[in-house]
């Protein structure tokens, strides 16, 4: 488990998890990622989104040395996006279909972010969402942007856990 | 950098329709909505409804409900605003903008045509 | 009938502070959605000045400041300048009317 004090994670636990949400993030919005959404001079808005970049540490060299910084940064992401999919973006209407696989995506992201930061240890947890009343008729826009955006987060933090499990799990 | 341009002024009678063009040039409006305001010579600005290209849905305010009608053609990304059984009350300045959002916030109408001048008169 | 109330029009002098209510209801501003600031110029489309109640566009100078409160938002212009004198109003999504709603607007004369 990667415990704010240092300790290892469970690579390969955390690995099999990951990959279950890419699973997950492709199959609750699979049309997302053939469509070209390029936005122009979004700066304001891309700020307010966890990513995971060169100096958050999950380089292979960044993870050997420490990987507590990757692994924080990838947390704080997990709790971002577990966020808004449990708001009214995703509860609201129009009504998910009875079959979505958001449900099971809204648990995986707690799942392993619990795996990443167990009962009674705390990482800041910057980046959390504040989040007004969304409005209806663009709620689908939101999901659609939502499900992009955590596609290729999740499929960054599966790489990540994928290099650690072959090459740092004990 | 977006800009949004309309189609040119009309005159139009009681009782017919016109049809508003906006055309996005210098990129697309996929991953946005669209909205049309109006206003009236010398009076405030009043939202009609949006439209979300993408996924060919509409939202219109509750008073045009039924008279307006907007559509969009991702192929040439230009939307279009359509307003029915004219009234000499419907004279005014109407305008496009993009509706932009974030992840999760509403980020506003950042960037307006230029507007299209209705005249409604016998 | 918008549902956003504003003052019909405010002034100040040069370099002055000068500030704007938005007043909603328990179905708008009241329910916790963003308000949105624009400024129009006569004869020209609205600009874009605050979004998310309090936040400003890149470009819009540190001036324009907005806030907000229960019911109501504000806009505060500091150090009033000849170019501010315009047409002002805030905008809300109204969930009792499906859609946004614009204020009735507030002009802003520089003495």
């Known amino acids: 488990r990667a415990v704010p004090g240092g300790s290892s994670p469970a690579w390969t636990q955390c690995q099999q998890l990951s990959q279950k949400l890419c699973t997950l993030a492709w199959s609750a919005h699979p049309l997302v990622g053939h469509m070209d959404l390029r936005e122009e001079g979004d700066e304001e808005t891309t700020n307010d989104v966890p990513h995971i970049q060169c100096g958050d540490g999950c380089d292979p060299q960044g993870l050997r040395d420490n990987s507590q910084f990757c692994l924080q940064r990838i947390h704080q992401g997990l709790i971002f996006y577990e966020k808004l999919l449990g708001s009214d973006i995703f509860t609201g209407e129009p009504s998910l279909l009875p079959d979505s696989p958001v449900g099971q995506l809204h648990a995986s992201l707690l799942g392993l972010s619990q795996l990443l930061q167990p009962e009674g240890h705390h990482w800041e947890t910057q980046q959390i969402p504040s989040l007004s009343p969304s409005q209806p008729w663009q709620r689908l826009l939101l999901r659609f942007k939502i499900l992009r955006s955590l596609q290729a987060f999740v499929a960054v933090a599966a790489r990540v856990f994928a290099h650690g499990a072959a090459t740092l799990s004990p | 950098k977006v800009q949004l341009v309309q189609s040119g002024a009309e005159v139009k009678k009681p009782g017919s329709s016109v049809k508003v063009s906006c055309k996005a040039s210098?990129?697309?409006?996929?991953?946005?909505?669209i909205s049309w305001v109006r206003q009236a010579p010398g009076q405030g600005l009043e939202w009609m409804g949006g439209f979300i290209p993408i996924f060919g849905t509409a939202n219109y305010a509750q008073k045009f409900q039924g008279r307006v009608t907007i559509t969009a053609d991702e192929s040439t990304s230009t939307a279009y605003m359509e307003l029915s059984s004219l009234r000499s009350e419907d004279t005014a300045v109407y305008y496009c903008a993009r509706d932009r959002t974030s992840l999760y916030y509403y980020y506003g109408m950042d960037v307006w045509g230029q507007g299209t001048m209705v005249t409604v008169s016998s | 009938q918008s549902v956003l109330t504003q003052p019909p029009s405010v002034s100040g002098a040069p370099g002055q502070r000068v500030t704007i209510s938005c007043t909603g209801g328990s179905s708008s501003i009241g329910a916790g959605y963003d308000v949105q600031w624009y400024r129009q110029l006569p004869g020209i489309a609205p600009k874009l000045l605050i979004y998310?109640?309090?936040n400003r566009p890149s470009g819009v100078p540190a001036r324009f400041s907005g806030s907000k409160s229960g019911a109501s938002a504000s806009l505060a212009i500091t150090g009033l300048q000849a170019e501010d004198e315009a047409d002002y109003y805030c905008v809300s999504y109204d969930s009792s009317l499906g859609g946004y709603v614009f204020g009735t607007g507030t002009k802003v004369t520089v003495l």
């Open positions: 210098g990129g697309t409006f996929s991953s946005y909505a």
């Open positions: 998310r109640s309090t």
